[in-house]
């Protein structure tokens, strides 16, 4: 891997498991104020595999609000607006990092957590299940 | 909002900007060992709006590797396997949290950063722009 010289201005770490426990500045850089995905694009409605967005809230997590996509139909919407069951609407999932308060209810101590979220849906050709 | 009593076992914070700077345990909980999205599903190939996955690596970021989706076509794949330009392949984007080493090259000091990533693509009905 790439070896990067350590910056002499780095904070010291007294943690024996260094760098397992690190200092994190929560002043978010590159902040995008638009956190409601419904406002950022209307793809969820215009897609051939449309989805609904469900608000998932957890005060013990940062960010506390995550939007989860749920595909509206089993099939995909065709040119006539009907559901075509020769195709499948499927969720596109992504693993994201969140901060989980640990110990619980602590304002300044967290643990990194990976969670799988559904971001939207896409239309795919199905794998046909043949009867045994 | 919900008021949660502070856990008496929380670590103390000497940071004047508390809780702007927090302690984070990097031992990831709920770790999903399958980090290569190509292995987790073949939707990127089976979709009517297929996409390619590009590896974005940055040693100053955690996670250092992020996969970015790029739609293969402007249009969508129809039942005959041809590109239908009456429809559009568009990226589904999501804002995710990453940790950025700050000051640079420091192993145990980070700042939270929000970045916009393309997770996959979906097929949408285009917005037709009429000439005035």
């Amino acid at each position: 891997g790439i070896t990067i010289p350590r910056n002499p201005g780095c904070p010291n770490s007294e943690d024996k498991n260094f760098p397992r426990t690190v200092m994190v500045n929560l002043n978010i850089h590159n902040r995008n104020t638009n956190t409601n995905p419904k406002r950022s694009s209307d793809y969820y409605n215009r897609s051939t595999s449309p989805w609904n967005l469900h608000r998932n809230e957890d005060p013990e997590r940062y960010p506390s609000v995550i939007w989860e996509a749920k595909c509206r139909h089993l099939g995909c919407i065709n040119a006539d607006g009907n559901v075509d069951y020769h195709m499948n609407s499927v969720p596109i999932q992504q693993e994201i990092l969140v901060l989980r308060r640990e110990p619980p209810h602590c304002p300044n101590s967290f643990r990194l957590e990976k969670i799988l979220v559904s971001v939207g849906c896409t239309c795919v050709t199905p794998i046909v299940h043949h009867v045994a | 909002g919900i008021t949660i009593p502070r856990n008496p076992g929380c670590p103390n914070s000497e940071d004047k900007n508390f809780p702007r700077t927090v302690m984070v345990n990097l031992n990831i909980h709920n770790r999903n060992t399958n980090t290569n999205p190509k292995r987790s599903s073949d939707y990127y190939n089976r979709s009517t709006s297929p996409w390619n996955l590009h590896r974005n690596e940055d040693p100053e970021r955690y996670p250092s590797v992020i996969w970015e989706a790029k739609c293969r076509h402007l249009g969508c794949i129809n039942a005959d396997g041809n590109v239908d330009y009456h429809m559009n392949s568009v990226p589904i984007q999501q804002e995710i949290l990453v940790l950025r080493r700050e000051p640079p090259h420091c192993p145990n000091s980070f700042r939270l950063e929000k970045i916009l990533v393309s997770v996959g693509c979906t097929c949408v009905t285009p917005i037709v722009h009429h000439v005035a």
């Epitope: 609904n52 139909h73 069951y85 046909v128 | -």
Partner: antibody, heavy 117, light 107 residues
């Protein structure tokens, strides 16, 4: 003409399973999805789920997730709905219905399932 | 899930009269609404789909209207065979749901 013929009435004990069949004729079976809807005596209609007769994939009402299975046999143009861990509240008439244009145009005659100890 | 509320619960009318049945959705369902008629001991029968399109063989005294959250089924002149229970159903998003029904009975 299009016809959906369902299997006969069933009496089951609580905790048991029931499998209802729906034989289609008069059209190409794999061209239309099949829905399952139930109706308790004197009550309204309740959507249970839908199966793509083409792929075999299904989507259920969350209320039944883990208890319902929907399958199909394309060679005999038949769809099946199996409900397990039966309870008295599952006593109802179960219908299969073909989907067309975001609606259910043809329905089976219904299968009465009685759950009683 | 999307909740469909039908009103009135019961409509008492005489043959020849006009029947107006309402169906309200808890959220916007565009025009993805169907109407069914059910008689005792029978399976439901499709009348209207896409909120306003009559199904094949349905008499033109049946008409549907509405979009978004408010939908109406109108029977312009009630015939004796029209006395039944009517259900609306949304096909906008799974789980697809039905209204509680409106019973049209002879006055």
């Amino acid at each position: 003409q299009v016809q959906l013929v369902q299997s006969g009435a069933e009496v089951k004990k609580p905790g048991a399973s029931v499998k209802v069949s729906c034989k289609a004729s008069g059209y190409t079976f794999t061209d239309y999805a099949m829905h399952w809807v139930r109706q308790a005596t004197g009550q309204g209609l309740e959507w249970m789920g839908v199966i793509s007769t083409y792929s075999g994939d299904a989507r259920f009402n969350q209320k039944f997730t883990g208890r319902v299975t929907m399958t199909r046999n394309t060679s005999i143009s038949t769809a099946y709905m199996e409900l397990s861990s039966l309870r008295s509240e599952d006593t109802a008439v179960y219908y299969c219905a073909r989907e067309v244009r975001r609606s259910m145009d043809y329905w089976g005659q219904g299968t009465t399932v009685t759950v009683s100890s | 899930e999307i909740v469909l509320t039908q009103s009135p619960g019961t409509l008492s009318l005489s043959p020849g009269e006009r029947a107006t049945l309402s169906c309200k959705a808890s959220q916007d369902v565009s025009t993805a609404v169907a109407w069914y008629q059910q008689k005792p001991g029978q399976a439901p029968r499709l009348l209207i789909y896409w909120a306003s399109t009559r199904h094949t063989g349905i008499p033109d005294r049946f008409s549907g209207s509405g979009s978004g959250t408010d939908f109406t089924l109108t029977i312009s002149r009630l015939e004796p065979e029209d006395f039944a229970v009517y259900y609306c159903q949304q096909h906008y998003s799974t789980p697809y749901t039905f209204g509680g029904g409106t019973k049209v009975e002879i006055k």
